[in-house]
């Protein structure tokens, strides 16, 4: 009996997690718990999750009287609440000159013309657009496209007619075709002068360009 | 535009069952948590019972005093949620409405609410 | 559950007052704050969000403040259409639990 005098229910404390030990009986104890446990000796951390309110795909991760939550990429904060700024993480979201907008859950892109696609890294096929007269071949650039124009074919489109193709320069002009109107140009050898290079110069002069 | 419109509320008696049906559009339904608020005539509001988003697997919550009486459901391809409610009460009496949570700490979205009115 | 106490239950004002309505939860709520307008007859209307942020198409007139238990929604200058019932609600935890109310009424 002597022996079981020494037994003190609280010294020491079995209260772990901080709780507090009252002895309400010559061999017992209670333990007031401190918010957040529970159990005979607060051992148990209570799992705050079952009544989570992680936001925008956040996944609950317990606490010790309060919850946390993983999130997504694009979310932070304690209980992703909080929009991550794209544009400011990744400077170069935006690929070829397009400009960055913030947005909840994400960002996008403000596209320069001829790009396109999320992050602005897409050449717009202007082709899909263009009118290259048939039988030319369509050439794609950015934001623009230009036209290969077949023999006899000139012009932006090439649905003017080649005017190259009569060989009206002679003695041994270069002949070149206005992309605009389609007349052909001469440019004369040394000697020669004229819309045609029929016409003989004066020995000082040298290349002359005519328009036709 | 983000819309909510409940339907199927009306006089029922007590014990009897009801289902409420809230029809979204302008979102996209499966992102959001989707929440049941109700309010007694003259009364304030109420939270009822919540399904959370996908992320969260649906997941579902219910107030002390509805739970195992109510049952939330959502129909992902009709982009709609629902309010089984049975073993009704003349305390259940109220305007029922449906909303979206923003996902910021707040309802972002109502509908225009439809009345339940238990009564013998 | 979350105890909301939301105080006052009402307010005499004329257009033109500052107004301001406070909303006390049992435990820390983490910001995790909204506040709502709603008009007879009609469904409730979120003002703020996250204890403070404006929501989009809301007068800069109303502002949220408050953090850990304490909240408080403040009506700059009230305006002919304010007069309304203006409830608190803590989204930090399930169950959600509203204030009980704050009838805004013409003086």
């Known amino acids: 009996a002597g022996s079981d005098s020494l037994y003190v229910p609280c010294a020491p404390s079995p209260c772990v997690n901080g709780g507090t030990c009252r002895q309400t009986g010559d061999f017992t104890f209670e333990c007031n718990c401190l918010p957040g446990f529970e159990g005979s000796t607060c051992e148990r951390n209570i799992d705050d999750c079952p009544n989570h309110r992680c936001q925008n795909g956040g996944v609950c991760v317990d606490g010790v009287n309060t919850y946390n939550c993983r999130c997504p990429p694009q979310w932070t904060g304690q209980f992703c609440t909080e929009d991550v700024d794209e544009c400011l993480l990744q400077p170069n979201a935006c690929q070829n000159g397009g400009t960055c907008a913030n947005r909840n859950g994400g960002y996008g892109c403000v596209c320069v013309n001829g790009w396109s696609g999320d992050d602005c890294s897409e050449n717009i096929d202007d082709c899909a657009f263009a009118s290259c007269t048939p039988g030319s071949t369509c050439i794609d650039r950015v934001a623009s496209f230009s036209c290969m124009c077949p023999e006899g074919k000139a012009g932006l489109l090439c649905h003017l007619d080649d005017a190259c193709i009569s060989n009206p320069c002679h003695k041994g002009a270069l002949c070149d075709t206005n992309p605009l109107n389609g007349q052909y140009i001469c440019t004369c050898p040394q000697g020669y002068k004229g819309a045609d290079c029929t016409e003989d110069v004066d020995e000082g002069n040298s290349h002359h360009h005519h328009h036709h | 535009e983000v819309q909510l419109v409940e339907s199927g509320g009306g006089l029922v008696q007590p014990g009897g069952s009801l289902k409420l049906s809230c029809a979204v559009s302008?979102?996209?339904?499966?992102?959001?948590?989707m929440e049941w608020v109700r309010q007694a005539s003259g009364k304030g509001l109420e939270w009822v019972a919540a399904s959370r988003n996908k992320a969260n697997d649906f997941s579902i919550v219910y107030s002390a005093s509805v739970k195992d009486r109510f049952t939330i459901s959502r129909d992902d391809s009709k982009s709609t949620a629902y309010l089984q409610m049975n073993s009704l009460k003349t305390e259940d009496t109220a305007v029922y409405y449906c909303?979206?949570?923003?996902?910021?700490?707040?309802?972002?979205?109502w509908g225009q609410g439809t009345l339940v009115t238990v009564s013998s | 559950d979350i105890q909301m106490t939301q105080s006052p239950s009402s307010v005499s004002a004329s257009v033109g007052d500052r107004v301001t309505i406070t909303c006390q939860t049992s435990?820390?709520?983490?910001?995790?704050l909204a506040w709502y307008q709603q008009k007879p007859g009609k469904s409730p209307k979120l003002l703020i969000y996250?204890?403070?942020r404006l929501q989009d198409g809301v007068p800069s007139r109303f502002s949220g403040s408050g953090s850990g238990t304490d909240y408080t929604l403040t009506i700059s200058s009230l305006q002919p259409e304010d007069f309304a019932t203006y409830y608190c609600q803590q989204g930090f935890k399930y169950p959600l639990t509203f204030g009980g109310g704050t009838k805004v009424e013409i003086k």
């Open positions: 435990e820390d709520i983490y910001s995790g």
């Open positions: 302008g979102f996209t339904f499966s992102d959001f948590y």
């Open positions: 909303s979206r949570d923003s996902g910021r700490w707040g309802l972002d979205a």
């Open positions: 996250g204890a403070s």
